[in-house]
């Protein structure tokens, strides 16, 4: 260090520290090969290994593959960062019916409220459109401001009613989003370092390619770096990001150095069999009749509930996708959970899974 620099600027002669003029303080010198987790590391724990591109460093200090959002019906919500996975969500005009870690396994188009119903809550990437009965004496088409406006950014114009939910078999169960908490927890990790004041001064999407030589001593820019299309997972392992290269998949969020790519079914298809950060099997979207009505939800795990229409009418859902192939799963996690209001019109216990029979009539799903 220069002799004319104040004594404290030399960090008291401590070789394991260096003086950062920008923050005017002594910083811990990360060992070669490790990257700092913040602009001015203070201790060894502030240094990390560098994962490959498209991998992220998870909470257990493992390089884990970021999910991909390459399926047509997915868009990237947050990029793959050094310490968090890429997060995918359903593209505008669709909502997630079956969640996957950092992604959505199954996206459906937002439903259009049928005749006699109006939009109560517009659809989002997480929730389907919520419909409610139009007030008597008011034109159904303009019963609320939402119905007299252009579709919101979360919806797309529809020339004909869009399916409100898929049917899955002759006793088809309605999909209910599962694994939301996992996705929410993963998403919450995105706030850890990339955008926090203590983070390194570069965007979270930066894979950390800056050092072209072995990490210079004192540069503090050396973290475990995974291969491209891998991310540093929570265990600190480099884990492969899922691939969305199948024709029926689109990328929802890209693979980042610290978060996985997430994939979802392309528009017009729904996920019949979920997979981590992706969908194992996509099937064409089924069609539901106009009488099926959506209701708001209290639980985050449920995208939509369906209120039974007034007595004397029955929902009429096409139970099979266009290609005749029915989704495989009829597990309770994909079943319709009837809320307390719906249970007033149907003699079914609250929270009981309900399926649509081949005739479209609600039946109790024993699970």
């Amino acid at each position: 260090f220069p002799q004319d620099r104040p004594f404290e600027d030399t960090c008291h002669g401590n070789p394991s520290h260096y003086y950062d003029k920008a923050v005017r303080r002594c910083c811990y010198r990360c060992p070669m090969g490790l990257f700092p987790t913040q602009q001015c590391p203070q201790r060894p724990t502030d240094c990390r290994k560098q994962c490959e591109p498209d991998y992220y460093l998870d909470e257990a200090d493992r390089c884990t593959a970021c999910v991909t959002c390459s399926r047509d019906d997915l868009v990237e919500k947050t990029p793959c960062a050094w310490n968090s996975s890429r997060v995918c969500e359903c593209r505008p005009g669709m909502f997630c019916s079956t969640s996957a870690v950092n992604s959505c396994a199954r996206c459906f188009f937002h439903s259009v409220c049928p005749a006699g119903m109006i939009v109560k809550f517009p659809g989002t990437a997480q929730k389907n459109t919520v419909c409610e009965p139009a007030s008597p004496g008011v034109s159904p088409a303009c019963a609320s401001p939402e119905n007299c406006k252009e579709p919101s950014s979360g919806t797309i114009p529809q020339a004909k009613p869009t399916p409100v939910s898929p049917a899955t078999s002759s006793a088809s169960t309605m999909p209910v989003r599962g694994g939301t908490r996992l996705a929410q927890e993963a998403a919450s990790k995105l706030t850890r370092a990339p955008d926090s004041p203590s983070s390194v001064g570069r965007p979270s999407s930066d894979p950390g390619l800056s050092p072209t030589q072995p990490c210079p001593e004192g540069s503090g820019d050396c973290r475990k770096q995974c291969e491209p299309d891998y991310y540093l997972d929570e265990a600190g392992r480099c884990t492969a990001c899922v691939s969305c290269s199948r024709d029926d998949l689109v990328e929802k969020t890209p693979c980042a150095w610290n978060s996985s790519r997430t994939c979802e079914c392309r528009p017009g298809m729904i996920c019949a069999t979920s997979a981590t950060n992706s969908c194992a099997r996509c099937v064409p979207y089924p069609i539901c009749a106009a009488e099926t009505v959506t209701k708001p939800q209290d639980m985050a795990e449920k995208d939509t509930t369906f209120e039974a229409p007034p007595l004397g009418t029955q929902p009429d859902c096409n139970p099979t996708p266009e290609n005749g192939e029915a989704p495989a799963s009829t597990s309770p996690t994909q079943s319709l959970l009837v809320d307390s209001q719906a249970s007033k019109t149907l003699p079914i216990p609250t929270s009981a899974p309900v399926a649509l029979s081949s005739t479209g009539k609600p039946v109790l799903d024993a699970g």
Epitope: P31, M32, D61, C215, R237
Partner: antibody
Framework: EVQLVQSGAEVKKPGSSVKVSCKAS????????MNWVKQAPGQGLEWIGQ????????NYNGKFKGRVTLTADKSSSTAYMELSSLRSEDTAVYFC????????????WGQGTLVTVSS | EIVLTQSPATLSLSPGERATLSCRAS??????????MLWYQQKPGQPPKLLIY???NVESGIPARFSGSGSGTDFSLTISSLEPEDFAMYFC?????????FGGGTKVEIK
């Protein structure tokens, strides 16, 4: 000076295993990925996998996964590649190589270890 | 996996001539604004030696006559004026996807 020194040539029987070592010096062994590359006689290069000695994290080429195990001993700054169920096509020179952080290049290589599989 | 195709397989040239080696990837090697393409030189009985990283960056200590170019899927290594010690095998490598893969190699031999 960075150096990677590999163990000597090996002759093995089909079905057996071989463990090649790579002793590193001159740098922070724990903080750099150690890659392993195969080169069959007169052939090109084939990436086997890599290990991060700091925590034992690994990436493998699927072609070798199941038969190759990469390990590292931080105390001796030595990386190991063990190949099991040997067959004749495993006859090759095996290199260890340090991977640079940042651009993923392999800047320092071991001298190579010839493994001959013959009955 | 990404397939790298090098051409030509053999390049017969004289010292002082310009050598251009090609490497084509089966998919893009772009990654956050850089191409994860590497070039190595290998001589008989020796390990490969890093020449070029990130498609166009010359490794420290490598003579300036070596240069790399290209992006996406098409890359090339150029030796502006061949020296006797440049006659060797050259391999391209991609690090964009695991598994990392190498090209089949181009042998630069004396004409």
């Amino acid at each position: 000076e960075v150096q990677l020194v590999q163990s000597g040539a090996e002759v093995k029987k089909p079905g057996s295993s071989v463990k090649v070592s790579c002793k590193a010096s001159g740098y922070a062994f724990s903080s750099y990925w150690m890659n392993w590359v195969k080169q069959a006689p007169g052939q090109g290069l084939e990436w086997i996998g890599q290990i991060y000695p700091g925590d034992g994290d690994t990436n493998y080429n699927g072609k070798f996964k199941g038969r190759v195990t990469l390990t590292a001993d931080k105390s001796s700054s030595t990386a190991y590649m063990e190949l099991s169920s040997l067959r004749s096509e495993d006859t090759a020179v095996y290199f260890c190589a340090r991977r640079i952080n940042g651009n993923f290049a392999m800047d320092y290589w071991g001298q190579g270890t010839l493994v001959t599989v013959s009955s | 996996e990404i397939v790298l195709t090098q051409s030509p397989a053999t390049l017969s040239l004289s010292p002082g001539e310009r050598a251009t080696l090609s490497c084509r990837a089966s998919e893009s090697l772009e990654y956050y604004g850089t191409s994860l393409m590497l070039w190595y030189q290998q001589k008989p009985g020796q390990p490969p030696k890093l020449l070029i990283y990130s498609a166009s960056n010359v490794e420290s200590g490598i003579p300036a006559r070596f240069s790399g170019s290209g992006s996406g899927t098409d890359f090339s290594l150029t030796i502006s004026s061949l020296e006797p010690e440049d006659f060797a095998m050259y391999f391209c490598q991609q690090r964009r996807k695991v598994p990392s893969t190498f090209g089949g190699g181009t042998k630069v031999e004396i004409k």
